[in-house]
């Protein structure tokens, strides 16, 4: 076959060659969150900036209403960082009061919604107990990994408590994906 | 062009096909930091090992004096981990003395300097309050994301306190970038 | 010097073109760990799920007995997250008892074993002191970077204490690699 002449002998080319600059890609950055209704026992989804500053979507990767829309099947690297900040967690207050010491926690989940499966799939989770001594605390949770996605899949970032998300700077809280 | 004949109809190839092994890439590892003058209100930049051990630069991605130099415009994945270590933070001392409890913090920033914008751009920031009970503490901050960079851009890693950086092992503190 | 401008000669193809969908890739997810013998002063290696749920291996990237096997030389992005959880660390108990305050710690290491070198190489390490106030704590350590690997190299993830690894969910603890 023409086009396979460059392939090293140990490897057959089954997939079309394609220019890297043409692959779906997105990097989304934090915006101030407007309180939205979310269902009980379901973490709220963050919404994002998709075109100002460092944010962009390209090559048919689109962002709409909290979701990154996957335009083409393939293996994607997906990542997010959420920076949380808060006042002293109840944990230490409870501790001082001698009550059971269940720590507070902060959690980030990257979730896939797909037509071919009725329930959302949790792709990545970062979860951390927060039991800080200081009166003000802040810390990031970073996630990133590769997943096989289908055209039409939707990705979102859910957090345990939207009010603790640091939305002040685009470099602190972000979400991205690119086709490998 | 030969090699483009397999392209699926939904996708025009606007960019030239190029061999993956020819793309600019670098992985830099920590070295002992020599105290350098840095200007007020500016976090100091780390310098790096670029050729010994696990470190390398290739395909026109060069390292010089704290900077990774971007040789070609495109979308890059950029990452860094900095491991910090220190003695008990002042935070807990302040707390014990009954004074206002402003926590210490550790911060990593990946910064872009570009000639198309007059001030450095903070691409990624990881910042964490440190208010440890233990007498010695250590922890990493990891960052990674994709950005559109221009030929001639320069990347550096800045930290809030260079004296807290663990420079003892190349696998603990590192900085890298590769063209997607 | 004029000759120091970036020449547009970067569009020459020096290496064979190859289809992206044909590259070695794997994403492995946590399973319950069976206690295994490990040598003194050597962190135990995790074993992984490689085909159920979110896990997969493809294009000659194979998983066997705790190791990812690298089928082709090149530059790989390697990543892992391990979520740890435990009861109050001894650190705070020791502190309360007035004994020397050496903090407990949690550590993840991504290790390469290669035929061409007698000792394993630590590629990435994430290590964190754990000195929690709360009675139950949990937190992730994330690592990711690019390395030049040789055909036949083997990758594994080692942890400081296998009993602290959260094996309950595939999105909390994972390990992956892909050829760039």
């Amino acid at each position: 076959l023409k086009g396979q002449e460059f392939a090293p002998s140990h490897q057959q080319v089954y997939a079309p060659l394609r220019a890297d600059g043409d692959k779906p890609r997105a990097h989304l950055t934090v915006v101030r969150q407007t309180p939205t209704q979310h269902f009980k026992n379901q973490f709220p989804a963050l919404h994002w900036e998709h075109e100002l500053g460092l944010a962009f979507t390209k090559n048919r990767m689109n962002y709409t209403n909290k979701f990154l829309l996957i335009p083409e099947s393939g293996d994607y690297f997906i990542y997010s960082q959420v920076t949380f900040r808060g006042m002293t967690s109840e944990c230490s207050e409870i501790r001082q009061a001698g009550r059971p010491n269940k720590p507070d926690s902060i959690t980030v989940v990257i979730t896939k919604v797909t037509d071919s499966y009725p329930e959302p799939t949790q792709l990545l989770m970062g979860t951390k107990s927060v039991c800080e001594v200081g009166s003000n605390w802040f810390q990031p949770i970073y996630l990133g990994a590769m997943f096989s996605l289908q055209e039409g899949d939707k990705l979102m970032v859910n957090v345990s408590d939207i009010s603790l998300v640091d939305y002040t700077k685009e470099d602190k809280t972000f979400f991205g994906a690119f086709l490998l | 062009l030969k090699g483009q004949e397999f392209a699926p109809s939904h996708q025009q190839v606007y960019a030239p096909l190029r061999a993956d092994g020819d793309k600019p890439r670098a992985h830099l590892t920590v070295v002992r930091q020599t105290p350098t003058q840095h200007f007020k209100n500016q976090f100091p930049a780390l310098h790096w090992e670029h050729e010994l051990g696990l470190a390398f630069t290739k395909n026109r991605m060069n390292y010089t004096n704290k900077f990774l130099l971007i040789p070609e415009s495109g979308d890059y994945f950029i990452y860094s981990q900095v491991t910090f270590r220190g003695m008990t933070s002042e935070c807990s001392e302040i707390r014990q003395a009954g004074r206002p409890n402003k926590p210490d913090s550790i911060t990593v920033v990946i910064t872009k300097v570009t000639d198309s914008y007059p001030e450095p751009t903070q691409l990624l920031m990881g910042t964490k309050s440190v208010c440890e009970v233990g007498s010695n503490w250590f922890q990493p901050i990891y960052l990674g994301a994709m950005f559109s960079l221009q030929e001639g851009d320069k990347l550096m890693v800045n930290v809030s306190d260079i004296s807290l950086v663990d420079y003892t092992k190349e696998d603990k503190t590192f900085f890298g970038a590769f063209l997607l | 010097l004029k000759g120091q401008e970036f020449a547009p000669s970067h569009q020459q193809v020096y290496a064979p073109l190859r289809a992206d969908g044909d590259k070695p890739r794997a994403h492995l997810t946590v399973v319950r760990q069976t206690p295994t013998q490990h040598f003194k002063n050597q962190f135990p290696a995790l074993h992984w799920e490689h085909e159920l749920g979110l896990a997969f291996t493809k294009n000659r990237m194979n998983y066997t007995n705790k190791f990812l096997l690298i089928p082709e030389s090149g530059d790989y992005f390697i990543y892992s997250q391990v979520t740890f959880r435990g009861m109050t660390s001894e650190c705070s108990e020791i502190r309360q008892a007035g004994r020397p305050n050496k903090p407990d710690s949690i550590t993840v290491v991504i290790t390469k074993v290669t035929d061409s070198y007698p000792e394993p190489t630590q590629l990435l390490m994430g290590t964190k002191s754990v000195c929690e106030v709360g009675s139950n704590w949990f937190q992730p350590i994330y690592l990711g970077a690019m390395f030049s690997l040789q055909e036949g190299d083997k990758l594994m993830v080692n942890v400081s204490d296998i009993s602290l690894v959260d094996y309950t969910k595939e999105d909390k603890t994972f390990f992956g690699a892909f050829l760039l």
């Epitope: - | 840095h38 010089t64 130099l69 000639d115 007059p118 | -």
Partner: antibody, heavy 116, light 106 residues
């Protein structure tokens, strides 16, 4: 305090090479980019080119590229401009400019007259 | 080259007046810069990234716009604002300036 100081001969003969040096202080030379901009009498501003002191990489205005060379000496914190084959049309105030770190800083300018 | 067309080339206004200068790029640019140059002096950066005020610049100066059309405004002209104002784009090679707008007091 950030300072840029241009220096060089104020008079250059036609067909000769104009040479100017910019000495910088008060900031980390490598952290920025250094440009040369000129302003001919009664005219607007014209960007000539820039150098990245960290790498030595340069970019030039295509209209001047065949005649202009910008170099740097990091040990002296200096950037130099050379413009060859000058004519009377090259008579101008030449400015050295820092970019990449706010504030954007300009030297006070150096008037160069091309005349026989 | 990206051509920068600045208008007007000169204007005369009274102290306290609102003054507006426009700059049109021949193709879209992400960032626009505005400089002030007083006679015999080097240009001084006033606005960067289309709308960010440089340090130490009075708040009566502002910038706006995106793509190809940008505006520079002095909300209340002061006697010390007598100068020539230039727009500049940094993205194309070469960097190009507008031809300048000379601002005078009536």
């Amino acid at each position: 305090q950030v300072q840029l100081q241009e220096s060089g001969p104020g008079l250059v003969r036609p067909s000769q090479t104009l040479s100017l040096t910019c000495t910088v202080s008060g900031f980390d030379f490598d952290d920025t980019y250094m440009h040369w901009v000129r302003q001919r009498p009664g005219r607007g501003l014209e960007w000539m080119g820039r150098i990245d002191p960290a790498s030595g990489h340069t970019k030039y205005n295509p209209s001047l590229k065949s005649r202009v060379t910008i170099t740097r000496d990091t040990s002296k914190n200096q950037v130099s401009l050379r413009l060859s084959s000058v004519t009377a049309a090259d008579t101008a105030v030449y400015y050295c400019v820092r970019s990449g770190g706010l504030p954007d800083v300009w030297g006070q300018g150096s008037l160069v007259t091309v005349s026989s | 080259d990206i051509q920068m067309t600045q208008s007007p080339s000169s204007l005369s206004a009274s102290v306290g007046d609102r003054v507006t200068i426009t700059c049109r790029a021949s193709q879209g640019v992400e960032y626009m810069y505005w400089y002030q140059q007083k006679p015999g002096k080097a240009p001084k950066l006033l606005i960067y990234g289309a709308s960010n005020l440089a340090s130490g610049v009075p708040s009566r100066f502002s910038g706006s716009g995106s793509g190809t059309d940008f505006t520079f405004t002095i909300s209340s002209l002061q006697p010390e604002d007598i100068a020539t104002y230039y727009c500049q784009q940094w993205e194309g090679n070469p960097r190009t300036f507008g031809q300048g707008t000379k601002v005078e007091i009536k």
